[in-house]
């Protein structure tokens, strides 16, 4: 098995992943692993000399960089907050704060606002991934309602009013539940069922 | 995944100057070297001139203080700026970039450069 440093007329190395093209010795030389930089590149009779990131700094890859790159916080401004360290290996991981989502992407999300309000009536539209777009806002399905503009509450279902021993008064809509009352009060004079001949 | 292409290859008349361009798209973010190498027919690939993702530049012995590599990271694109061209430089034109701080090493279709009176 050849290993670092080692001659390359074709400009390929044997491992994509773990090591570089040195293009004016002509040679393949080790890249520094996640976590890591390099201290010392190498040369025809040695190898790349790799150090450990200090402390608020990370290289997330395999890679041959003369730096570690300085530690990121969550841009508190931007609507952003964090849900993991920052690390030797991995830069801070960011989410938009609950109630946002994310409004601008350059490989991670940079700056986000606050999630439209859903009307009476409908509800936001569940996505897989919190945080990843705007509500999308959809009717209540039969027989459920939603009564507030809201952007994070959920189509309830219709109270059933046999359930608690009562009886209809009001069928239920998208905006508003059912109303119920008691099976001896009596209905109100344009609500009952009388004829007068 | 990343692609690039070349452009700005052609005829010339010794003496001339070309431009090449060199524009990188798709999945293209990170930290890059790139390179400008040639091949004439019947030759290996040599390298012409280097730009490090730190800023320097380097060159081939036989291209210095004619050729001049610069790069657009805004644009994602290298050029190689080909003055006081000579016969010997005929060859097909390749531009080359490697990730520094991931994995990863791309090369162009090539365009042929022909000087010729």
């Known amino acids: 098995q050849v290993v670092p440093p080692y001659g390359s007329e074709n400009q390929t190395c044997r491992d994509q992943e773990k090591e570089y093209y040195e293009p004016r010795h002509r040679i393949c030389c080790s890249r520094c692993p996640p976590g890591t930089y390099v201290s010392a590149k190498c040369s025809r009779s040695r190898d790349t000399v790799c150090a450990t990131c200090a402390e608020n700094s990370y290289n997330e890859h395999w890679n041959y960089l003369t730096i570690c790159q300085l530690c990121r916080p969550c841009d508190p401004v931007m609507g952003l907050e964090e849900i993991a360290p920052c690390t030797s290996k991995r830069k801070t991981q960011c989410r938009c704060q609950p109630g946002m989502f994310c409004a601008a992407w350059a490989l991670e999300c940079t700056h986000c606002e606050l999630l439209s309000d859903c009307p009476p009536g409908t509800e936001a539209e569940l996505k897989d991934e919190v945080g990843k777009g705007n509500n999308h806002c959809v009717p209540c399905k039969a027989g459920h309602f939603q009564n507030t503009s809201s952007p994070s509450a959920r189509c309830q279902p219709h109270t059933r009013c046999e359930d608690q021993g009562l009886v209809e008064a009001a069928p239920g809509t998208a905006q508003s539940d059912t109303t119920c009352r008691n099976p001896s009060e009596s209905l109100p004079p344009e609500m009952s069922g009388t004829m007068l001949m | 995944d990343v692609q690039l292409v070349e452009s700005g290859g052609g005829l010339v008349q010794p003496g001339g100057s070309l431009r090449l361009s060199c524009a990188a798209s798709?999945?293209?973010?990170?930290?890059?070297?790139m390179y400008w190498y040639r091949q004439a027919p019947g030759k290996q690939r040599e390298l012409v001139a280097i730009s490090t993702s730190g800023g320097h530049t380097n060159y081939a012995d036989s291209v210095k203080g004619r050729f001049t590599i610069s790069r657009d990271n805004a644009k994602n694109t290298v050029y190689l700026q080909m003055n006081s061209l000579r016969p010997e430089d005929t060859a097909v034109y390749y531009c080359?970039?490697?990730?520094?701080?991931?994995?990863?090493?791309?090369w162009g279709q090539g365009t042929l450069v022909t000087v010729s009176s």
């Open positions: 798709g999945r293209f973010f990170g930290i890059y070297d």
């Open positions: 080359n970039i490697q990730r520094v701080d991931a994995p990863g090493f791309y």
